[in-house]
Interface confidence: low
């Protein structure tokens, strides 16, 4: 057994540039030739245990064989030189690992950052992958002094081991080196103070002002290298539920500061704030954002009164009536605070008044048949809204003036209502709506619109294929005008069932068919027309179309003594639905006729 290898491969540590050619040689020792009775022609080259084709191999002399590879692309190849001893037994002589890759690119985009409280970190773009072990060294020096090299672990960044010295320029560059070459980046020259990224401001607090409901005061603590740097700020805020931030103009926060008053905010609204800082010259990097802090602006009196309406309940007799005053809770944007209660004042025409404090959104009062004026104001802890005023006329007064050209139509999944105003100046409009049903009472919802509005959409949660009865009432200073109503659908569908047809009268050659209107709950839309299909057991089917206003129809030119099958369908704008089939037989003779 030979302890010494039988030969060697040269080069022993081959590194090849990808895409280039490469030649290796295997030199056998003289002792080996004699021991195994071989020469170089017995050499078998293998890559990753697979024999290399003969055409790539050249026998140079009795001890030496070469192998040539063109366009090397594999990152790593096990190359072995083997001999066929005694003509058949394969014996390994020597093996090497052949690596391929690229020389390093010149590093680019070299940038450095000094995170406050940490050493300087520099980053660069190393360029294309080398596929080889490549060392990246960050070098830095003053004009007169070199700093310790920084050996990069990842090849794209390095944090220097020394603390930065501010207000003195430093030169920094990167050297990249591997088995195929060595290259340096362009150097950059800067003062580390201009590369500082401050730590985020902290202890951000938000306070409101009782005097001004539109402001919030911010205060915070800045670091800035322990006061070494003057910092300017960037302040952003949003309402609690919003996803987008509002920017305080940067020119307002350019000077170094640790407090700021944000203006033009909405009353009684929660805002979330965040702040970051940078060197006041604008050089360096913005800090990360501070932790968010929130605050709520102070309440302001409600900006408008609630929508206000009333309904007269069935009369208790001649002496008095029960009136239910109803109103809508103000949206937050108008309430400007927590509504504590509502103040309702009812004034009789003789100047007798009664004040009620109500926490809910309705109040039922008993009134005589005189005219009353009702006023309603919403109250929060700052004050009261302006009053909404309603005149409740005597029940003996007939309402005059109503809207004209009332229309309703669906659009964009909303039910729109439009009208032409009456000729007399209006204070506001009340829209009321409910689902028409034979199975349940018409439970009304309502909304109020300003006097300038003559087109709006219903703001309730409407259901498809339900018939809505919509009423529009103009309200004047003297009280409500006349009400106009119509029916509308948010979205129609085909009817749930078709009509059930029956015969009202059957003659020898004609039959009067009758049917009931489909209940409104099953209509699912406006019934536009009916179709009547009729046939005999052997005859062709006949179809007649009937207007939706009819509930009977006479079939004529029928054959006597014949069984007829009849079916009706009802159609909305969205399709039709058949009713059940019905059969009848015409008599053989007309009344009074004999054979």
């Amino acid at each position: 057994q030979l302890l010494e290898p039988c030969g060697y491969i040269y080069p022993e540590f081959p590194v090849v540039q990808r895409g280039s050619n490469f030649t290796a040689i295997c030199v056998l020792k003289e002792a080996c030739l004699q021991h195994y009775y071989v020469n170089a022609s017995y050499i078998v080259w293998k890559t990753n245990h697979a024999a290399v084709p003969r055409e790539q191999v050249t026998v140079i002399n009795r001890t030496t064989s070469s192998v040539t590879f063109t366009d090397v692309v594999l990152p790593s190849v096990q190359l072995t030189c083997n001999i066929l001893s005694f003509g058949q037994i394969e014996q390994n002589v020597y093996g090497v690992t052949m690596l391929s890759g690229f020389p390093p690119d010149k590093p680019t985009n070299l940038t450095c950052i000094v995170n406050e409280g940490k050493n300087m970190l520099c980053q660069w773009d190393p360029g294309r992958e080398t596929y080889l072990e490549t060392n990246y060294t960050l070098k830095s020096e003053w004009a007169t002094e070199k700093f310790p090299d920084c050996q990069s672990k990842h090849g794209t960044s390095c944090m220097v081991s020394y603390m930065p010295t501010y207000y003195v320029n430093i030169e920094v560059w990167v050297e990249a080196e591997n088995a195929l070459g060595k290259v340096s980046s362009e150097s950059i020259n800067f003062d580390p103070v201009d590369k500082v990224k401050p730590t985020p401001p902290y202890n951000l607090s938000v306070t409101n002002s009782e005097e001004l409901s539109s402001i919030l005061k911010l205060s915070w603590v800045s670091s800035g290298l322990g006061g070494l740097l003057d910092l300017k700020s960037d302040i952003q805020y949003r309402t609690k539920d919003a996803s987008t931030w509002i920017q305080v103009p940067l020119e307002d926060t350019m000077s170094p500061r640790t407090s700021f008053t944000v203006q033009d905010l909405k009353p009684f609204t929660e805002y979330v704030f965040r702040i970051r800082s940078i060197k006041d010259s604008g050089k360096g990097y913005w800090s990360d954002w501070s932790e968010e802090a929130s605050g709520t602006t102070y309440e302001d009196r409600p900006s408008r009164p609630p929508s206000f309406w009333y309904k007269t309940n069935p009369s208790h007799g001649q002496e008095y009536r029960s009136v239910r005053l109803i109103w809508k809770a103000l949206p937050l944007s108008e309430a400007n605070g927590k509504i504590l209660d509502y103040e309702v004042i009812l004034t009789q025409s003789k100047s007798v008044s009664q004040t009620y404090t109500v926490t809910g959104t309705e109040l039922t009062v008993n009134l005589t048949n005189d005219r009353y004026v009702a006023s309603l104001a919403a109250r929060n802890k700052v004050g009261k809204s302006a009053a909404a005023v309603l005149t409740i006329p005597s029940p003996h007064v007939t309402a005059a003036y109503s809207v004209v050209n009332l229309k309703a139509f669906p659009k964009d999944n909303l039910l729109w209502v439009e009208w032409t105003p009456p000729p007399k100046p209006v204070s506001k409009y009340i829209l009321e709506w409910c689902v028409l049903s034979e199975n349940a009472p018409c439970v009304e919802d309502w909304q109020q619109e300003d006097a300038t509005v003559n087109r709006t959409h219903l703001r309730g949660r409407l259901l498809e294929s339900k018939c809505y009865q919509i009423t529009v009432t103009p309200v004047f200073a003297t009280g409500p005008g006349g009400s106009e109503s119509l029916k509308a659908y948010l979205k129609q569908a085909a009817p749930a069932r078709g009509p059930t047809v029956r015969t009202k009268k059957v003659g020898k050659n004609e039959a009067v068919l009758a049917w009931d209107q489909i209940p409104v709950d099953d209509q699912n839309g406006f019934i536009r027309n009916y179709s009547i299909s009729y046939r005999t057991s052997v005859g062709k089917e006949m179809v007649v179309h009937v207007d939706s206003s009819h509930t009977e129809y006479t079939l004529s030119s029928l054959s006597s003594d014949t069984l007829y099958m009849v079916r009706m369908a009802a159609y909305t704008d969205e399709g039709g639905k058949d009713g059940p089939e019905f059969t009848f037989t015409t008599p053989k003779f007309a009344q009074g006729e004999i054979e």
Epitope: T359, G360, T361
Partner: nanobody
Framework: QVQLQESGGGSVQAGGSLRLSCGIS????????MGWFRQVLGKEREGVAA????????VYADSVKGRFTVSQDSSKNTVYLEMNGLKLEDTGMYYC??????????????????WGQGTQVTVSS
Amino acid sequence: QVQLQESGGGSVQAGGSLRLSCGISGFTYRPTFMGWFRQVLGKEREGVAAISTGGGSSVYADSVKGRFTVSQDSSKNTVYLEMNGLKLEDTGMYYCAASTVITSVSINRGLYQYWGQGTQVTVSS
């Protein structure tokens, strides 16, 4: 999963007191108002009292006004019914109910979507 769990029922002598509790859980959004109902065997379930979970405003059935008080502890997600001066006719199964209908607080049974299993109150002479 929405759950309402009543507790605190039991037997008491006329003129006595009981305090019912109702724990609520599983709501994505809290109910608009919570109510207490009672049912005597063979009779319709009737509204006793209700409280708005937002403003705390409440309504009562005439038969319990001045004797019963409904309250809530938002932090514990619990609604209570304090019953004083109990009468024989207050006997029945008491149910806690929750409504998500956005309307004024009410003891209208039809406005309630979620119901508890009930707790028995028995008033004896």
